[in-house]
Interface confidence: low
């Protein structure tokens, strides 16, 4: 229903705490360079204004749209042009163009320092002094670094953070309580970020229809006992929620997500037998739990897919009468039978089925033409299955760090023009797929591996879009979202690349590396590895392994030496010489 004051309506629905959190996230995602204090001031002003509208919906400006209200606030910031350059030009536009302009200026890779976690004691002190400000800082720091983070989920992670701090700060050994728990939240949040970015990319590049197809496949896998009408309703609602969040309409998004969770819990009987545990949870935990709820048990008596989609004499008639509904039904029926497939694979199969019907229904004898369509799915299914087997075998043999290095070599050869930091980031993320997915039961590996890889490759595409340097990457990123992963997998060594000159300073290290945390040490070594491949793109795995082992030995020796600086300055040049010789 229409409300006299949109801002009052959202404030009432969400409550002050979540209203403020979401407004803070929205501002932090739009203006990523502003400090927490600047944003906190804006949030307070907006909240105070919302309260006046709750008291009197007819008060001045209360009838304005949220985009108008928020946009006016952002555009009133002093020194906008000095700090944000051409983003300030957005303020010359009217809504809805102004909001579109803000969205286009979101930076997926802002030049902000990494979000460093303070040491335990300091963290607990500031948390106890002012939990609200502490959590505000968390929301601000995450949101500005991840401008498409799913806002209601970020509130959930902040709540997790809060619970961990409340528990651990009461313990004697705060550090050992906090570190593993916060690391766990961080890991989950980073995965959530790349997954959501993928959804927004799907929405931005291919529209709502593409996202809805993704949702139908995903929901059908999870809720195989729900009928097609129910799945369509859930997919439509989920599409609306994601469209709002991707579009910066965070209050509407969180409110509608809450409504969807409520609907699901009120209609468990027609959706799934697995929802009760989630529905018993409070607050944000409920929607989070529903978003990753386990698959319901598949109905035992499902007929073969061929009956309705290959053998039925009316296939072409049904397709012609309502293409989207017929294809949607196919996607639903195929997906509910295959929780062991990735959503990307299911969408590729639906695309293949559509292309087959387009071709065959125009021919003289359609059934003879489309009769073999299910058999033609076989190579499409085998390709990702082989990918999973090959990569999980390699992961089990090498471990996470070694597996990351293997991927780094592979991707540097595929796209050596891409900047080394981007290649290292991508390889480290792609390499985590082993730890994340290869330990799962067989039937869960494929969906885990491929959908995770697709999300990471989407980030590679976004970063490459900013400064396109590799024709290989451009080619794979220009195609459809579901074809990206197979495209990247199929890339081979870029023959057009002219190898980089060998620069000794690239491989010169100093004693400061010894005091770095293990993760930072790994990044330094992986940076050197990528540079080696750029110097010798056709180096063999054995050659590279020899060099990297030598390098690891050199670091180990010098970091244990009494006079580290002397060791690095004398042994370093010897290492560089040995590297050149090994790769000659």
């Amino acid at each position: 229903e229409a409300h006299k004051s949109e801002i009052a309506h959202r404030y009432n629905d969400l409550g002050e705490q979540h209203f403020k959190g979401l407004v803070l996230i929205a501002f932090s995602q739009y203006l990523q360079k502003c400090s927490y204090d600047e944003h906190a001031k804006l949030v307070q002003e907006v909240t105070d204004f919302a309260k006046t509208c709750v008291a009197d919906e007819s008060a001045a400006n209360c009838d304005k749209s949220l985009h108008t209200l928020f946009g006016d606030k952002l555009c009133a910031i002093p020194n906008l042009r000095e700090n944000y350059g051409e983003l300030a030009d957005c303020c010359t536009k009217q809504e809805p163009e102004r909001n579109e302009c803000f969205l286009q200026h979101k930076d997926d890779n802002p030049s902000l320092p990494p979000f460093e976690r303070p040491e335990a004691e300091a963290m607990c002190t500031s948390f106890k002094e002012n939990p609200t400000t502490f959590m505000g800082h968390y929301l601000h720091e995450v949101a500005r670094r991840h401008p498409y983070f799913y806002a209601p989920e970020l509130l959930y992670y902040a709540e997790q953070y809060n619970e961990i701090l409340t528990q651990c700060c009461a313990e004697a050994d705060k550090e050992s309580c906090l570190t593993p728990k916060l690391d766990g939240v961080k890991e989950k949040a980073l995965v959530s970020s790349v997954r959501q970015r993928m959804k927004c990319s799907s929405m931005q590049k291919f529209g709502e229809r593409a996202f809805k197809a993704w949702a139908v496949a995903r929901l059908s896998q999870t809720f195989p006992n729900a009928d097609f009408a129910e799945i369509t309703k859930l997919a439509t609602d989920l599409t609306k929620v994601n469209k709002e969040c991707c579009h910066g309409d965070l209050l509407e998004c969180a409110d509608d997500r809450a409504e969807l969770a409520k609907y699901m819990c009120e209609n468990q009987a027609t959706i799934s037998s697995k929802l009760q545990t989630c529905c018993d949870k409070p607050l944000l935990k409920k929607a989070h739990c529903l978003s990753e709820v386990e698959h319901d048990t598949m109905p035992a008596d499902l007929p073969a897919i061929a009956a309705d989609f290959v053998e039925d004499q009316e296939v072409c008639k049904n397709y012609a009468e309502a293409k989207d509904v017929f294809l949607g039904t196919f996607l639903y029926e195929y997906s509910r039978r295959h929780p062991d497939y990735s959503v990307s694979l299911l969408l590729r199969l639906a695309k293949k089925y559509e292309a087959t019907l387009e071709k065959c229904c125009a021919e003289a004898n359609p059934p003879a033409c489309y009769g073999t369509v299910l058999a033609e799915f076989q190579p499409l299914v085998e390709e990702p299955k082989n990918l999973v087997k090959t990569n999980c075998d390699l992961y089990e043999k090498l471990g996470e760090y070694g597996f990351q290095n293997a991927i780094l070599v592979r991707y540097t050869q595929k796209a050596p023009q891409v900047s080394t930091p981007t290649l290292v980031e991508a390889a480290r993320n792609l390499g985590r797929v082993g730890t994340k997915c290869c330990t799962l039961p067989e039937d869960q590996r494929l969906p885990c591996v491929e959908d995770y890889l697709s999300a990471i490759l989407n980030r590679v595409c976004l970063l490459h879009e900013k400064t396109p340097v590799s024709e290989h990457v451009t080619k794979c990123c220009s195609g459809s979202l579901v074809e990206r992963r197979p495209c990247f997998s199929a890339l081979t060594v870029d023959e057009t690349y002219v190898p980089k000159e060998f620069k000794a300073e690239t491989f010169t290290f100093h004693s400061d590396i010894c005091t770095l945390p293990e993760k930072e040490k790994q990044i330094k070594k992986q940076t050197a590895l990528a540079e080696l491949v750029k110097h010798k793109p056709k180096a063999t795995a054995e050659q590279l392994k020899t060099v990297m082992d030598d390098f690891a030995q050199f670091l180990d020796t010098c970091c244990k030496a009494a006079d580290k600086d002397t060791c690095f300055s004398t042994e370093g040049p010897n290492l560089v010489t040995r590297c050149k010789d090994a790769l000659a």
């Epitope: 409550g15 002050e16 809450a258 018993d280 409070p282 607050l283 944000l284 409920k286």
Partner: nanobody
Framework: QVQLVESGGGLVQPGGSLRLSCAAS????????LAWYRQAPGKQRDLVAR???????HYADSVKGRFTVSRDNAENTLVLQMNSLKPEDTAVYYC??????????WGQGTQVTVSS
């Protein structure tokens, strides 16, 4: 949805005490924050005190040290213990429940009058 019913209001002399109760029913599992608001004639509704699901409390400056808010999650009740009452505490007191999944709920209100 959450339904709220207040009780315990009445007439009291300045310096006296009153104990307001609020019984919550319905989807009480979804509540994160419970609060008391008050509205004096011709004024807007103001926050008096609130308590989060974790038990942390917040009070309006005007009632700090005099009022205590508590909740019993098992019984789904919210209590406001009001001591050292002043004439300016006269108002209709409303119970409020904030939930992430449902719109906020308000009780019907209970009248508190502080007068000699």
């Amino acid at each position: 949805q959450v339904q709220l019913v207040e009780s315990g209001g009445g007439l009291v002399q300045p310096g006296g005490s009153l104990r307001l109760s609020c019984a919550a029913s319905g989807s009480t599992w979804s509540i994160n924050t419970l609060a008391w608001y008050r509205q004096a004639p011709g004024k807007q509704r103001d926050l008096v005190a609130r308590i989060s699901s974790g038990g942390s409390t917040h009070y309006a400056d005007s009632v700090k040290g005099r009022f205590t808010v508590s909740r019993d999650n098992a019984e789904n009740t919210l209590v406001l213990q009001m001591n050292s009452l002043k004439p300016e505490d006269t108002a209709v007191y409303y119970c409020y429940a904030q939930s992430t999944w449902y719109p906020p709920s308000w009780g019907q209100g209970t009248q508190v009058t502080v007068s000699s």
